[in-house]
Interface confidence: low
Amino acid sequence: AARPGFQQTSHLSSYEIITPWRLTRERREAPRPYSKQVSYVIQAEGKEHIIHLERNKDLLPEDFVVYTYNKEGTLITDHPNIQNHCHYRGYVEGVHNSSIALSDCFGLRGLLHLENASYGIEPLQNSSHFEHIIYRMDDVYKEPLKCGVSNKDIEKETAKDEEEEPPSMTQLLRRRRAVLPQTRYVELFIVVDKERYDMMGRNQTAVREEMILLANYLDSMYIMLNIRIVLVGLEIWTNGNLINIVGGAGDVLGNFVQWREKFLITRRRHDSAQLVLKKGFGGTAGMAFVGTVCSRSHAGGINVFGQITVETFASIVAHELGHNLGMNHDDGRDCSCGAKSCIMNSGASGSRNFSSCSAEDFEKLTLNKGGNCLLNIPKPDEAYSAPSCGNKLVDAGEECDCGTPKECELDPCCEGSTCKLKSFAECAYGDCCKDCRFLPGGTLCRGKTSECDVPEYCNGSSQFCQPDVFIQNGYPCQNNKAYCYNGMCQYYDAQCQVIFGSKAKAAPKDCFIEVNSKGDRFGNCGFSGNEYKKCATGNALCGKLQCENVQEIPVFGIVPAIIQTPSRGTKCWGVDFQLGSDVPDPGMVNEGTKCGAGKICRNFQCVDASVLNYDCDVQKKCHGHGVCNSNKNCHCENGWAPPNCETKGYGGSVDSGPTYNEMNTALRD
């Protein structure tokens, strides 16, 4: 066989060229739809393995959606019919606890996880004889070897990372099954940025196939934790990026989750959204929030897909999604996964295995009810062609979905067999649905969560509460001591109380200056590459949070390091959660905190509050009887009517829903 082109194997230190044979009766040239089940014989390292594959019917829901944009920037929605897709999962005959994620679209491409090794397989470029290359995943990053770096040097470099006699995968899986008996389903939404789309030759089909392949790989990694990955949607920024991707990873992550909350959630329900970018951030290939998978505002991550294979990229996405699922880094903890490095190791690349720590972290998330959105099954367990009525998800064309016939016996509003409302019912679910009827307009459905939030009410003609809005960023709160920011009054005392308990309060300014001028993990103004940044005096109040009067020590799933610094007659308390540089640090002062007269913290700098773009003159716009909300509309006090609070009424805004009911004004809270 001809040697593959340099491009295909330049990232490999060792590989074999093989010709798999198909064991089923159908010829390889069989037309689509692809077989539901197929078996192959493949060779690896002198051994023949029989692999059994089954189409991954859980990978894509029937209503899988792809969003793109035309040249004018108009959103285009496509529901591609890809139920008979070519993405499979399976196992190696006779190999206990093996797993496989392969696509059989144009030859075999994917991952084989055996008990002691993982292999990659892909079609040999320009081969007309169904030849493939197969390689150990461990051999992917040994390119330095051909550049004059000896094996001994590599061994010395990596020896200290290797664990002595890790437990076998069988033991680990047995332990995990006991820990996580109930299957969880992550409804994943992927967004691909313009540069990555361009890099793929602006070929939407190629991007879509690659992202489905990625989801199949993720599913094969997460299945060991009894977590299934379901790709519910894909958005490709074909016409330009819809967020600013200039700046650090933290800035881009913040921009992405804000965009997600504002534009994506309303379009397609999902549990976590992951942005795929071509642009790199130096040493950081991804960033995500920890334990936020079911959060409206923070269930997202960003992932750099540059000059690497999709197989390697899968471990990056698995890592960042793992953070969303409550998993912290394995570093410095007693973790094992039966491999040299595990997916949640901070520096691991190409790892396929989750550690015992990751399983425990995820279990903590579920015990703390942080994973409730993962319980619904996105689609039925039957084949793709099966109707989706009965999956407890209201799909296109359904009015309700109460689940199995047994569950539907308990539902007074929904006809289980048809997923339609019963004849007398107006609704079957939702915050504004009670006893199969819409709640009256003016019924409170989402209360005020802070002095910077506003309530929402049912509108009387929908089962859903009005979309969540809050007071416009930059509005003064805490008696002018702070500003509203994303629905919260951001001030130091409150942040100290979240971390150190109800008696804690902000330390004096001297504490912030003294500690944050050091530029170490306990006192800094952010992290740049491999070093902490020292805070200039003017930015010290925007670095690590410093508290006093501490009487409680925090534990948030991971035990943080706590430092106590004596300063001018008080003790300054700070905390380092050691989450790593791809995770926003909850021990830093929150964005939007007032750090001086007319100033707020942003990106660890004390900057002019004008960056919040607060432009509401409440006297003029709301006639002194209301405040502006996050949509820049007046939210009026009780006694005044929207939109401008100049006539008598019952308060609220054009966004909040009616705050009263003409039949019963006592409904107002």
């Epitope: 390119e143 330095p144 550049c147 951030f281 040493g283 950081t284 520096g347 690349s349």
Partner: nanobody, 127 residues
Framework: EVQLVESGGGLVQAGGSLRLSCAAS????????MGWFRQAPGKEREFVTV????????YYEDSVKGRFTISRDNAKNTVYLQMNNLKPEDTAVYVC????????????????????WGQGTQVTVSS
């Protein structure tokens, strides 16, 4: 494939200065970081410094902080290592390395994370 060529090495007295260059060619758009390592006779290879291609972020090993400065010229695809106040213990072969894989949290000091290497240039500091 990225190619790296070092130059500028030589013999210098203690307290003197040298400027090393590392010219990159090939698909340099894929480079994330470029670093310098050194290897003295009979010793293990040792990390010296790194610079991030995109934004110029730098990181130095403690033993060279304040004496060595790494910089880059994007237009010329070249990285420089300015070495001042050289000491006899700085004697070694200095090798340039490039990282093209955007690892999540790269350990700059680990040679394993660099995928292209130059041939090296000898620096000898006499006392």
């Amino acid at each position: 494939e990225v190619q790296l060529v070092e130059s500028g090495g030589g013999l210098v007295q203690a307290g003197g200065s040298l400027r090393l260059s590392c010219a990159a060619s090939g698909p340099t758009f894929s480079i994330y970081d470029m670093g310098w390592f050194r290897q003295a006779p009979g010793k293990e290879r040792e990390f010296v410094t790194v610079i991030r291609w995109s934004d110029g972020f730098t990181y130095y090993e403690d033993s060279v902080k304040g004496r060595f400065t790494i910089s880059r010229d994007n237009a010329k695809n070249t990285v420089y290592l300015q070495m001042n106040n050289l000491k006899p213990e700085d004697t070694a072969v200095y090798v340039c390395a490039a990282n093209t894989a955007p690892l999540r949290i790269i350990n700059f000091r680990n040679a394993y994370n660099y995928d292209y290497w130059g041939q090296g240039t000898q620096v000898t500091v006499s006392s």
